[in-house]
Amino acid sequence: TESYCGPCPKNWICYKNNCYQFFDESKNWYESQASCMSQNASLLKVYSKEDQDLLKLVKSYHWMGLVHIPTNGSWQWEDGSILSPNLLTIIEMQKGDCALYASSFKGYIENCSTPNTYICMQRT
Amino acid sequence: TESYCGPCPKNWICYKNNCYQFFDESKNWYESQASCMSQNASLLKVYSKEDQDLLKLVKSYHWMGLVHIPTNGSWQWEDGSILSPNLLTIIEMQKGDCALYASSFKGYIENCSTPNTYICMQRT
């Protein structure tokens, strides 16, 4: 059976009723977050390997909405929810408090001021 | 403005009203083609860098619907249409008459009998 997906912003990717867009321009984490917010979206949140299995195919590194809380060492999403165990393998690439998404559900720690491409997501 | 995408088979990726699915199981080109056909789709056809810019992000190698015609050296899609120039860089990885899609609009020549993952596509 066929079905429609969305609704999503024009020309975004729709998968399992979530909307994704990959942005080519390099921005720091804060600018990336602002860019997503301006489009009524947020930086990528990884919440399910099953519902987001398209992410295993993504090449390169892109900012996602995951940040490190230095005071307690936890990893949280922009919305304040805590990273679920077994979802991402967090790799210490640089000293930093932000994370880049890389293929096969890996997260690379990076300085939040470093420019990178980014992924915005909108949950429908 | 937001809009719906599709219609697509359940759990396929929808982008600019085309439907895509990435299959993990390795099959030869002919089996991959049959698998797509059984789902009322075809192997990936690359026809536009603009309309299919999500493909630049794809990691790894996957069968697409491009075949080499040994008698005249042309590259054609399953539907008989000719590969447009400037769309794909065709790289001679192996001697063969089928092509794997790889990120950034590259096509790798491979023996059609070699098992690989594959991308199905359905144009809406």
């Epitope: - | 080499h68 015609i69 040994p70 005249n72 050296g73 042309s74 590259w75 249409s81 000719i82 590969l83 447009s84 120039p85 400037n86 794909l88 860089t89 065709i90 790289i91 001679e92 192996q94 001697k95 096509g107 020549i109």
Partner: antibody, heavy 122, light 107 residues
Framework: EVQLVESGGGLVKPGGSLRLSCAAS????????MNWVRQAPGKGLEWVSS????????YYADSVKGRFTISRDNAKNSLYLQMNSLRAEDTAVYYC???????????????WGQGTLVTVSS | DIQMTQSPSSVSASVGDRVTITCRAS??????LAWYQQKPGKAPKLLIY???SLQSGVPSRFSGSGSGTDFTLTISSLQPEDFATYYC?????????FGGGTKVEIK
């Protein structure tokens, strides 16, 4: 700078043989298909033969099939054309040309060498 | 084999003129067409590829158009250095074939 330099042309009798060479520089030779194109005196251009980057695909014009052999040595950045059973109608300037764009779906020729003249006459 | 028919075989024009050369393929070749310029005693030079893409370093007065079977090379304002012979070539299949050439001469 991309450069192609042909050599090996000359005067040969009908039925004779000649081997043309093309030395390439300024680009990654092993990534490109290569070609021979000829031009008879006062005439137009005629494609002769093409060889893919790894020599997997080789094509010849009907007029030279069975008599000419194209080959390449990627380690030496060199392209060759072995010409046997030469005929008067093979008299032409022979150009070596790189296939463009990069890869196996190379539809056109850029750049071209300066050419080498092959004269077949008794 | 795909035949390429070029017309006219020669054209006389003056500096500043607009010159149009046409090329017809005997079967559809999508956009797999190139145009070359050749001056006497010199090797051909690629001007246009993929029917309409201008090769790097080629002046913008040269343009190409067409798809399928009918193609055009246009020189918008002929310059003294443009007097030469022009060839079209299909690149979709082997054997690669050229048009017969168009000689652009000074009027």
């Amino acid at each position: 700078e991309v450069q192609l330099v042909e050599s090996g042309g000359g005067l040969v009798k009908p039925g004779g043989s000649l081997r043309l060479s093309c030395a390439a520089s300024g680009f990654t030779f092993s990534s490109y298909s290569m070609n021979w194109v000829r031009q008879a005196p006062g005439k137009g251009l005629e494609w002769v033969s093409s060889i893919s980057s790894s020599s997997s695909y080789i094509y010849y014009a009907d007029s030279v099939k069975g008599r000419f052999t194209i080959s390449r040595d990627n380690a030496k950045n060199s392209l060759y054309l072995q010409m046997n059973s030469l005929r008067a109608e093979d008299t032409a300037v022979y150009y070596c040309a790189r296939g463009a764009p990069v890869g196996a779906a190379a539809g056109w020729f850029d750049p071209w060498g300066q050419g080498t003249l092959v004269t077949v006459s008794s | 084999d795909i035949q390429m028919t070029q017309s006219p075989s020669s054209v006389s024009a003056s500096v500043g003129d607009r010159v149009t050369i046409t090329c017809r393929a005997s079967q559809g070749i999508s956009s797999w067409l190139a145009w070359y310029q050749q001056k006497p005693g010199k090797a051909p030079k690629l001007l246009i590829y993929a029917a309409s893409s201008l090769q790097s370093g080629v002046p913008s007065r040269f343009s190409g158009s067409g798809s399928g079977t009918d193609f055009t090379l246009t020189i918008s304002s002929l310059q003294p250095e443009d007097f030469a012979t022009y060839y079209c070539q299909q690149g979709v299949s082997f054997p690669r074939t050229f048009g017969g050439g168009t000689k652009v001469e000074i009027k």
